[in-house]
């Protein structure tokens, strides 16, 4: 929801977290903001005390429930308010009505490990974290390794275009430190977005054979 | 491999009910959604509603909302779908199927509701 | 609630040849549109998600598109077993619904 010079961006994570960022140019620093969650359907609601996070703008999560459970379904609705304190009154100051499912930003992928590594080639696995049972195999991620004397900008991304909690890295130098990073998205969603990057992972290849070619 | 066996076909009297049941197996019954399709022969396919066993939350479409029943029992992975105060109209072929919420990946073979005075 | 219209009601086309199916949704459904088979006496089978996604073990010569509100299923070179009811459902505003089929024959 954008007016005027305000921006009103939420994402649900799948589960039972919906983060926000509102920013509003000119807006005051000191002023008490909050996001308020009125679902269409349900007889809880939620609220989160906006945070400064940068200049113009300011972030907070609405906790719906215990991180595993399913709070929102595929027909929820949800009125999401910014409401800021003006001396004793409170002021709406952006509203939409927000379709979980069609907003979606899951956490990053977690647990990432080094399954089997050798001179070329690592395996690599990883787990979602507080991702929807609704989603079945519909996912897809992303991913990409750091080469030493290179910036993370520069990893060519590798596209998995399948729930695959795996990869096998190629043509690796021999005894060579990396790094890994994933993240997912599901194709559910007109405003879908991916997740953060997973925590980067650092492995070393192994050292090729003395004697052999490599 | 995914399979979602439904109970025989059914003749019922206008007003009674019916339970058809859907017994399924190759995947975690408890993290799925069972739905239920209606298929009648002159207005096609119609989504009546599902259940999120995990949850227990059944989502239940407008035109069959005051007499579809929607359950499951996850101690013989198998779901049930009741409809009531049958009339002429509800003669049709209902399937069970499997998938997240908007879409049916994997389908029952269906059961013939047949409802005549 | 929304309605799907989908045409034409029943298409006539050679093995071999190219067929092309539509789907018209009465308002704006971004791209939660899928496309399911169904022959006779069997169960409908899904066979596109999300406007163009294939799912896995369907033929490459399935393929959808979207432009707008309209939305088209193509079979680049029909086989035998294609003939049959294809039936689009749109999943953007419950209770989901599906289109009346178009039934692709034998010319």
């Known amino acids: 929801a954008v007016n005027g010079t305000s921006r009103f961006t939420c994402f649900y994570n799948s589960r039972a977290n919906i983060s926000c960022v509102w920013s509003q140019d000119g807006a005051l620093q000191d002023t008490s903001c909050q996001v308020h969650a009125w679902p269409d359907r349900r007889r809880w609601n939620q609220t989160c005390e906006l945070l400064p996070v940068s200049q113009a703008s300011w972030a907070c999560n609405l906790i719906l429930g215990t991180p595993d459970s399913q709070k929102l379904t595929a027909v929820d609705i949800v009125t999401l308010r910014v409401m800021c304190r003006e001396g004793v009154r409170w002021r709406m100051m952006a509203i939409q009505d927000f379709k979980p499912f069609e907003n979606l930003r899951l956490m990053a992928p977690i647990s990432l490990q080094v399954v089997h590594v050798e001179t070329h080639r690592c395996n690599i696995s990883w787990k979602i974290s507080q991702a929807s049972h609704y989603f079945e195999r519909h996912l897809e991620f992303e991913a990409r390794t750091l080469s030493p004397g290179h910036t993370w900008e520069e990893a060519p991304l590798m596209t998995l275009k399948q729930k695959q909690e795996w990869i096998c890295l190629e043509t690796l130098t021999p005894d060579t430190q990396y790094e890994f990073q994933v993240r997912v998205k599901p194709l559910q969603g007109e405003f879908t977005t991916w997740s953060p990057w997973s925590q980067p992972l650092a492995f070393r290849t192994k050292p090729a054979a003395l004697g052999k070619d490599t | 491999e995914v399979q979602l066996v439904q109970s025989g076909a059914e003749v019922k009297k206008p007003g009674a009910t019916v339970k058809i049941s859907c017994k399924v197996s190759?995947?975690?019954?408890?993290?799925?959604?069972i739905h239920w399709v209606q298929q009648a022969p002159g207005k096609g396919l119609e989504w009546m509603g599902w259940?999120?066993?995990?949850?227990?939350?059944?989502e239940y479409a407008p035109g069959f909302q005051d007499r579809v029943t929607i359950t499951a029992d996850t101690s013989t992975d198998t779901a049930y779908m009741e409809l009531s105060s049958l009339r002429s109209e509800d003669t049709a072929v209902y399937y069970c199927?499997?998938?997240?919420?908007?879409?049916?990946?994997?389908w029952g073979q269906g059961t013939t509701v047949t409802v005549s005075s | 609630e929304i309605v799907m219209t989908q045409s034409p009601a029943t298409l006539s086309v050679s093995p071999g040849e190219r067929a092309t199916l539509s789907c018209r949704a009465s308002?704006?459904?971004?791209?939660?549109l899928h496309w399911y088979q169904q022959k006779p006496g069997q169960a409908p089978r899904l066979l596109i998600i999300?406007?163009?996604q294939s799912i896995s073990g369907i033929p490459a010569r399935f393929s959808g598109s979207r432009s707008g509100t309209e939305f088209t299923l193509t079979i680049s070179s029909l086989q035998s077993e294609d003939f049959a009811v294809y039936y689009c459902?749109?999943?953007?505003?419950?209770?989901?619904?599906f289109g009346q089929g178009t039934k692709l024959e034998i010319k």
């Open positions: 199927a499997r998938g997240g919420p908007w879409f049916l990946s994997y």
């Open positions: 999300y406007g163009l």
């Open positions: 259940i999120d066993v995990e949850a227990g939350e059944t």
């Open positions: 459902q749109q999943s953007n505003n419950w209770p989901w619904t």
């Open positions: 308002q704006i459904i971004s791209n939660n």
């Open positions: 190759g995947f975690n019954f408890k993290e799925s959604l």
